[in-house]
Interface confidence: low
């Protein structure tokens, strides 16, 4: 892979729709991750600083942004439901973490270039009370 | 997997004020409707997955579009999919 | 609006200490994250330590076991207690806050922090 062109992911975290908490009783936050090069992250949820995987569900592959283009910047969502009584609780915390595999082109990294640094882009909420 | 009682609903999340890009929720629906790619390059919309909440027993399906487009809205994100009209929830603004 | 004051940098021998301070104003009721991120001369910006409204603390690992991030919540402040200084921790440290969901995201002008015989 072409270490000179590596773009981490930006990372955000879009808060529940207060529409499908009244409707379902349910809230579903959604992380994305966007305009990485190449295309391989691993994306977790954590909620009160433990790993969860229930409620959880990931896109199996990233999706091209640019389908057209070989070598197009890719993008990754997630979504992470939890109860409505869950997310209303503001004490709870919930932090979508996308780890990332590559190298800068301005990297100082010293050890042998062939290892990968791993960076750690992570966006977070809150558990909203109202407001 | 088969999903009890279907309800398909398209929800309009929301961002930071930083950040300029628009998400939709498609979720809830059967597991027979089949979520279609944009035709627009600069409407982003992933395949169908599946989110099972153990402790609740409840499965579901779910879609999501984005784009940073200013005038992108969730009536027309999944447009080239078969969507009621019904099921679009307008986000209210947000006093907070 | 949230603003951050960064104050307590200055110049210390190798092997001293130096505390830290940030100062936030404005709507603080939102904050829900806190951070120390440093940039030294010619390098990028990066995390040193972050603490959430639950106390929740992370730090780097040139970080561990030598700085300490802690918060007066009643003060508004955030503090990096920094032991065991090198040369290399010579930097611009800024604080960082976030308020309810990323990236609501303030940064104060920064601290010089130096470390020199």
């Known amino acids: 892979e072409d270490l000179k062109k590596v773009f981490p992911p930006k990372v955000a975290v879009f808060e529940p729709s207060e529409a499908e908490i009244s409707h379902t009783q349910k809230a579903t936050l959604v992380c994305l991750a966007t305009g990485f090069y190449p295309d391989h992250v691993e994306l977790s949820w954590w909620v009160n600083g433990k790993e969860v995987h229930s409620g959880v569900s990931t896109d199996p592959q990233p999706l091209k942004e640019q389908p057209a283009l070989e070598d197009s910047r890719y993008s990754l969502s997630s979504r992470l439901r939890v109860s409505a009584t869950f997310w209303h609780n503001p004490r709870n915390h919930f932090r979508c973490q996308v780890q990332f595999y590559g190298l800068s082109e301005d990297d100082e990294w010293t050890e042998d270039r062939d290892k990968p640094i791993t960076q750690k882009i992570s966006a977070e909420a809150w558990g909203r009370a109202d407001c | 997997p088969y999903i009890q009682n279907p309800d398909p609903a398209v929800y309009q999340l929301r961002g930071s004020k930083s950040n300029d890009t628009s998400v939709c929720l498609f979720t809830d629906f059967d597991s027979v409707m089949n979520v279609s790619q944009s035709k627009d390059s600069d409407v982003h919309i992933t395949d169908k997955t599946v989110l099972d909440m153990r402790s609740m027993d409840f499965k579901s399906n779910g879609a999501v579009a984005w784009s940073n487009k200013s005038d992108f809205a969730c009536t027309s994100a999944f447009k080239d999919s078969v969507i009621p009209a019904d099921t679009f929830f307008p986000s209210p603004e947000s006093s907070c | 609006e949230v603003q951050l004051v960064e104050s307590g940098g200055g110049v210390v021998q190798p092997g001293g200490s130096l505390r830290l301070s940030c100062v936030a104003s404005?709507?603080?009721?939102?904050?829900?994250?806190y951070g120390w991120y440093r940039q030294a001369p010619g390098k990028e910006r990066e995390k040193v330590a972050h603490i959430s409204i639950g106390d929740q603390t992370d730090y780097a690992d040139s970080a561990k076991g030598r700085f300490t991030i802690s918060r007066d919540e009643s003060k508004n402040t955030v503090y990096l207690q920094m032991n065991s200084l090198r040369p290399e921790d010579t930097a611009l440290y800024y604080c960082r806050a976030l308020s309810r969901i990323w990236p609501y995201d303030y940064w104060g002008q920064g601290t010089l922090v130096t470390v020199s015989s």
């Open positions: 404005g709507s603080v009721h939102k904050i829900n994250f």
